[in-house]
Amino acid sequence: EQAPGTAPCSHGSSWSADLDKCMDCASCRARPHSDFCLGCSAAPPAPFRLLWP
């Protein structure tokens, strides 16, 4: 069992205070009102790091 703030959620998941649990961000497209969706990135990470500003 994970307590809030003691360990980060794994990649692709976000903490739900409502459920006291890390939840999968993939469900947010279908169920956008979930509280953990606020912690999910709106866009996927860039596939590479830009080499110029």
Epitope: E1, P4, A17, D18, D20, S27, R31
Partner: antibody, heavy 123, light 111 residues
Framework: QVSLKESGPGILQPSQTLSLTCSFS??????????VSWIRQPSGKGLEWLAH???????RYNPSLKSRLTISKDTSRNQVFLKITSVDTADTATYYC???????????????WGQGTSVTVSS | DIVLTQSPASLAVSLGQRATISCRAS??????????MHWYQQKPGQPPKLLIK???NLESGVPARFSGSGSGTDFILNIHPVEEEDAATYYC?????????FGGGTKLEIK
């Protein structure tokens, strides 16, 4: 049609272990986000949340009773179980199980409850 | 634990009038964009029935005369106009953190 039904021993003696079963239909406890809670209510009094089990077998307990509680499930049989050890007269109550799962928008309400099972602890 | 204090403990409201039930939390049950407060109705011999989830969202099938509001530590359940079938005990409950707790209940009588 979602429904839940609790069953238990009815009467037991102090120091014994209380075993409760919640049998449900109309949803699956293997569905992501789904869970079942146990809540109790002494006659004429308020509600107390006891424990919760998630679809992935993660468990949560009320800290005030955690040392005495064990929640478990049998997903294939659509059942959730609660054991309370070393019962006392203060554990006399109606015990409810309730579903907590995602609605259409992604809220997670305790939306369906069983009718409850009455438990009396008496010597 | 977050303690939820409901007031009044009981009230009598005339048919067609407004019933207002308060629930005060010992600490905030809201974030900047989410309020984790819910309301249930319980009639004698029956399990609680979910009325309102997340402060103001009416559960499916619940009449529009029920409404909820509030944020932070102060929440309200309003029933207007009150009908005979609304005679019951009402409970607030939060899901902001563990343990999930309930208020002590408010018994509504219809005059």
């Amino acid at each position: 049609q979602v429904s839940l039904k609790e069953s238990g021993p009815g009467i037991l003696q102090p120091s014994q272990t209380l075993s409760l079963t919640c049998s449900f239909s109309g949803f699956s406890l293997s569905t992501s986000g789904m869970g079942v809670s146990w809540i109790r209510q002494p006659s004429g009094k308020g509600l107390e949340w006891l424990a919760h089990i998630y679809w992935d077998d993660d468990k949560r307990y009320n800290p005030s009773l955690k040392s005495r509680l064990t929640i478990s499930k049998d997903t294939s049989r659509n059942q959730v179980f609660l054991k309370i050890t070393s019962v006392d007269t203060a554990d006399t109550a109606t015990y409810y199980c309730a579903r907590r799962g995602p609605d259409y928008y992604g809220y997670y309400p305790m939306d369906y409850w069983g009718q409850g099972t009455s438990v009396t602890v008496s010597s | 634990d977050i303690v939820l204090t409901q007031s009044p403990a009981s009230l009598a409201v005339s048919l067609g009038q407004r019933a207002t039930i308060s629930c005060r939390a010992s600490k905030s049950v809201s974030t900047s964009s989410y309020s984790y407060m819910h309301w249930y109705q319980q009639k004698p011999g029956q399990p609680p029935k979910l009325l309102i989830k997340y402060t103001s969202n009416l559960e499916s099938g619940v009449p529009a005369r029920f409404s909820g509001s509030g944020s932070g530590t102060d929440f309200i359940l309003n029933i207007h106009p009150v009908e005979e079938e609304d005679a019951a005990t009402y409970y607030c409950q939060h899901s902001r953190e563990l343990p999930w707790t309930f208020g002590g209940g408010t018994k509504l009588e219809i005059k």
